[in-house]
């Protein structure tokens, strides 16, 4: 909107706010068991891990902020089976970390998030 | 889990990860119009704003990370009514900013988020 109507500083603050809300990788915490699709008798300690995931707003309401590039981070977690038959096992869990994001019209057909090795 | 079974450094890393995923206020972006429940002929520029909202994990699956204290931040936004009858108006929109969070068993009865003044 024309700067003549409004204070330049106010417009600058609004614009900076808008830039910060744009679709980009953001640190978020994900629940490992639900992402892995594990049965209810298997759980992890800690149950959640911190990774970067795409989030934020797009210039059009119909677009969705989606990942375009992903790296996998290995997290050391305790895997616990109930009933407890053995000592909780320390396992490496590969978690998807979104490194690139884009506002896309539709969700991808195969969303991958976590790979157990 | 007993430290005797595992490397102290590994346990420390796991514990730090766990602390970072705990229920707490996290910077997030919210869509103003949908939070305000505005009709489609009223929209805001920018459409999204950055605020702190409760997020993260709880120790029990039955608990939800909810806000226990809230402050309201005033954001200067353009409110645009369509059909456009006048110049877009610069309005102060009060947006809920979560300042305290807790893992609670149920959602509160009255969730407040944005107040227009």
């Amino acid at each position: 909107f024309a700067a003549t109507f409004y204070d330049i500083e106010t417009l600058k603050v609004i614009d900076e706010e808008w830039q910060r809300t744009q679709c980009s990788p953001r640190e978020t915490c994900v629940e490992v068991a639900s992402e892995l699709g594990k049965s209810t008798n298997t759980f992890f300690k800690p149950p959640c891990v911190n990774v970067f995931r795409c989030g934020g707003c797009c210039n059009e309401e119909s677009l969705i902020c989606m990942n375009t590039s992903t790296s996998y981070i290995s997290k050391q977690l305790f895997e616990i089976s109930v009933p407890l038959t053995s000592v909780p096992e320390l396992v490496p869990v590969k978690v998807a970390n979104h490194t690139g994001c884009k506002c896309l019209p539709t969700a991808p057909r195969h969303p991958y998030s976590i790979i157990r090795r | 889990f007993a430290a005797t079974f595992y490397d102290i450094e590994t346990l420390k890393v796991i514990d730090e990860e766990w602390q970072r995923t705990q229920c707490s206020p996290r910077e997030t972006c919210v869509e103003v119009a949908s939070e305000l429940g505005k009709s489609t002929n009223t929209f805001f520029k920018p459409p999204c704003v950055n605020v702190f909202r409760c997020g993260g994990c709880c120790n029990e699956e039955s608990l939800i990370c909810m806000n226990t204290s809230t402050s309201y931040i005033s954001k200067q936004l353009f409110e645009i009514s369509v059909p456009l009858t006048s110049v877009p108006e610069l309005v102060p929109v009060k947006v809920a900013n979560h300042t305290g969070c807790k893992c609670l068993p149920t959602a509160p009865r009255h969730p407040y988020s944005i107040i227009r003044r």
Partner: antibody
């Protein structure tokens, strides 16, 4: 007020490339996607794709993929559309159009007529 | 691609009389977010297109209230309650739910 000013008419030979420009004013350039739409003489509208000026992300109509490139210069609030390997059926008026948050193409340039002839 | 089919392709109307244009899409235009991104554009002779209606029924700025839009799913209608001389031109429906964005083939509104 919002204005989209497009470059003048161009005549090109088959096989050549054309680059049309669209200078925006009266709004925050990076806050809106810019669409490119073409219209052959006496025909309807055809969507070519769009660019997000905030980060340069593009989405193209598959029909033009490999032949079209959309770019922006945020310093001058200008959007560009380059079409390569021109054919006679690329003769059309090429419009830039700003797209609102709600998806409608709310402001249009006056168009750039591109004539492809040998 | 989503095919947008408009009817009629030509509509001769008497000044002051109502006019109606239909637009049918080959797939539902309801987005996963619940919104329907169906828009109507007007193109007067020698002019660029102009947005009339966005998201099925919302009139854009400066558009007279004699223009109205309705419909849902795959069937949509643009109505002009009383046609005026300045309404002459081609009307297009367009969708922005799916990529590629597509347009109807256009309906030419002319005065009898």
């Amino acid at each position: 007020q919002v204005q989209l000013v497009q470059s003048g008419a161009k005549v090109k030979q088959p096989g050549a490339s054309v680059k049309a420009s669209c200078k925006a004013s009266g709004y925050t350039f990076t806050g809106y996607n810019m669409y490119w739409v073409r219209q052959a003489p006496g025909q309807g509208l055809e969507w070519m794709g769009y660019i997000d000026p905030y980060n340069g992300d593009t989405t193209y109509n598959q029909k033009f993929k490999g032949r079209v490139t959309m770019t922006t210069d945020t310093n001058t609030s200008t959007a560009y559309m380059e079409l390569r390997s021109l054919r006679s059926d690329d003769t059309a008026v090429y419009y830039c159009a700003r797209t609102s948050y709600y998806g409608g193409m709310d402001y249009w340039g006056r168009g750039t007529l591109v004539t492809v002839a040998s | 691609d989503i095919v947008m089919t408009q009817t009629p392709l030509s509509s001769p109307v008497t000044l002051g009389q109502p006019a109606s244009i239909s637009c049918r899409s080959s797939q539902s235009l309801v987005h996963s977010n619940g919104n329907t991104y169906l828009h109507w554009l007007q193109q007067r002779p020698g002019q660029p297109p102009r947005l009339l209606i966005y998201k099925v029924s919302n009139r854009f700025s400066g558009v007279p209230d004699r223009f109205s839009g309705s419909g849902a799913g795959t069937d949509f209608t643009l109505k002009i309650s009383r046609v005026e001389a300045e309404d002459v031109g081609v009307y297009y429906c367009s969708q922005s739910t799916h990529v590629p964005r597509t347009f109807g083939q256009g309906t030419k509104l002319e005065i009898k």
